[in-house]
């Protein structure tokens, strides 16, 4: 038997993936655990194997279909259960009625690229990945730039309150190496959260022209 507090959190990427983390305070013997997904009105169900990510935390991804297929909508409710094997039987450890479009976390933006770079500014674009057509333009972004001698945590956040897949960074220092990251969040969903940060994009501003005051 398992004692202690259990926490079971899942997010839908808006297309064909539900990622879950199950945390259990208290001893859990070496045992096999799974997440089972049963939609309320769909003719499919899905299972994934929970794998340890820390001492008392396990995670798995329910792959519902091809990456860009729209497997769930705002009308759906999915019963999610954590099931652990106890001898020859399965025991239910956690359960939730999961509303996918209330619990969104999109994939990190991809394809970051420098469109144009100058001495003091840089124009960067990106793309969103595996985002549902249901959002239309109802997305927002946060971006941050890593300057020399600073950490990501110190970088000020820039907010784009609309679906804008580019940014023009201003007041940069000439001939300086920077890194840039962006993340995305739908406006929909009570428990919706930010996507992971994108892979950092490294770029260098152009040197100031010789003989010019800077």
């Amino acid at each position: 038997a398992v004692n202690g507090t259990s926490r079971f959190t899942c997010f839908y990427n808006s297309r064909a993936n539900i990622s879950c983390v199950w945390s259990q305070d208290g001893a859990l013997q070496d045992t096999s655990c799974q997440v089972h997904a049963w939609p309320d009105r769909r003719r499919w169900n899905q299972t994934c194997e929970l794998l340890p990510v820390s001492q008392a935390s396990w995670a798995c991804n329910l792959i519902l279909g091809t990456p860009d297929s729209q497997k769930l909508t705002a009308v759906d409710i999915v019963t999610l259960r954590v099931m652990c094997r106890e001898g020859v039987r399965w025991r239910m450890m956690a359960i939730q009625d999961f509303k996918p479009f209330e619990n969104l976390r999109l994939m990190a933006p991809i394809s970051l690229q420098v469109v144009h770079v100058e001495t003091h500014r840089c124009n960067i674009s990106w793309k969103i990945s595996q985002a549902s057509h249901y959002f239309e333009r109802h997305l927002e972004f946060e971006a941050r730039t890593l300057s020399p001698g600073h950490t990501w945590e110190e970088a000020p956040l820039m907010t784009l309150k609309q679906k804008q897949e580019w940014i023009c960074l201003e007041t940069l220092t000439p001939d300086t190496q920077y890194e840039f990251q962006v993340r995305v969040k739908p406006l929909q969903g009570e428990f919706t959260t930010w996507s992971p940060w994108s892979q950092p994009l490294a770029f260098r501003t152009k040197p100031a022209a010789l003989g010019k005051d800077t």
Partner: antibody
Framework: QVQLVQSGAEVKKPGASVKVSCKAS????????IEWVRQAPGQGLEWMGE????????NHNEKFQGRVTMTRDTSTSTVYMELSSLRSEDTAVYYC?????????WGQGTTVTVSS | DIQMTQSPSSLSASVGDRVTITCKAS??????VAWYQQKPGKAPKSLIY???YRYSGVPSRFSGSGSGTDFTLTISSLQPEDFATYFC?????????FGQGTKLEIK
């Protein structure tokens, strides 16, 4: 096998209410949404709303908001749809249907005639 | 509300013909589209769900295709029992809506 059996035909006067029943068998009643769809004579299909018997959750077509009431009795595996303030344009065949994949099993239909 | 526009509204064909009915959604509904067959005085019968999946017991001559806004029901070789009215439906978002129907008649 899955079956949805509806109550018999009704004749009502304008302004009255009608309550149609739908008795389910052959599957786990609590697990699947029951939808209500109506069809006026010679017309297409119109979705009215749905109820999930296990939880009692309900979603309505806003067109019927305030006039339609959906309930369930889990002891008899029966769902009810009541439509109030009837008018002549509510004359139709009313169907209950289970939602699994799409609307996979349908009741035989209940004819409701609204006439003064 | 999402409008489902079916065409044609009526169609005359002969036994053995290949018949195609189309349905256009007013906005993207993914693959959340179903097709139903209805005969006079009877309840609709489910044929296709998720745009292309046939229910068990439905003959293989019925097939569905499409995604986004454009959907098709094809009957590869019409049989006498196929003469009926066909409806498409979206169940992607509330309120669920149906096409106006296509009446398939014997030529």
């Amino acid at each position: 096998q899955v079956q949805l059996v509806q109550s018999g035909a009704e004749v009502k006067k304008p302004g009255a209410s009608v309550k149609v029943s739908c008795k389910a068998s052959g599957y786990t009643f609590s697990r699947y949404w029951i939808e209500w769809v109506r069809q006026a004579p010679g017309q297409g299909l119109e979705w009215m709303g749905e109820i999930l018997p296990g939880s009692g959750s309900i979603n309505h077509n806003e067109k019927f908001q305030g006039r339609v009431t959906m309930t369930r009795d889990t002891s008899t595996s029966t769902v009810y749809m009541e439509l109030s303030s009837l008018r002549s344009e509510d004359t139709a065949v009313y169907y209950c249907t289970r939602h699994y994949g799409s609307f996979d099993y349908w009741g035989q239909g209940t004819t409701v005639t609204v006439s003064s | 509300d999402i409008q489902m526009t079916q065409s044609p509204s009526s169609l005359s064909a002969s036994v053995g013909d290949r018949v195609t009915i189309t349905c256009k959604a007013s906005q993207n509904v993914g693959t959340d589209v179903a097709w139903y067959q209805q005969k006079p005085g009877k309840a609709p019968k489910s044929l296709i769900y998720s745009a292309s999946y046939r229910y068990s017991g439905v003959p293989s001559r019925f097939s569905g295709s499409g995604s986004g806004t454009d959907f098709t029901l094809t009957i590869s070789s019409l049989q006498p029992e196929d003469f009926a009215t066909y409806f498409c439906q979206q169940y992607s978002s509330y309120p669920f809506t149906f096409g106006q129907g296509t009446k398939l008649e014997i030529k």
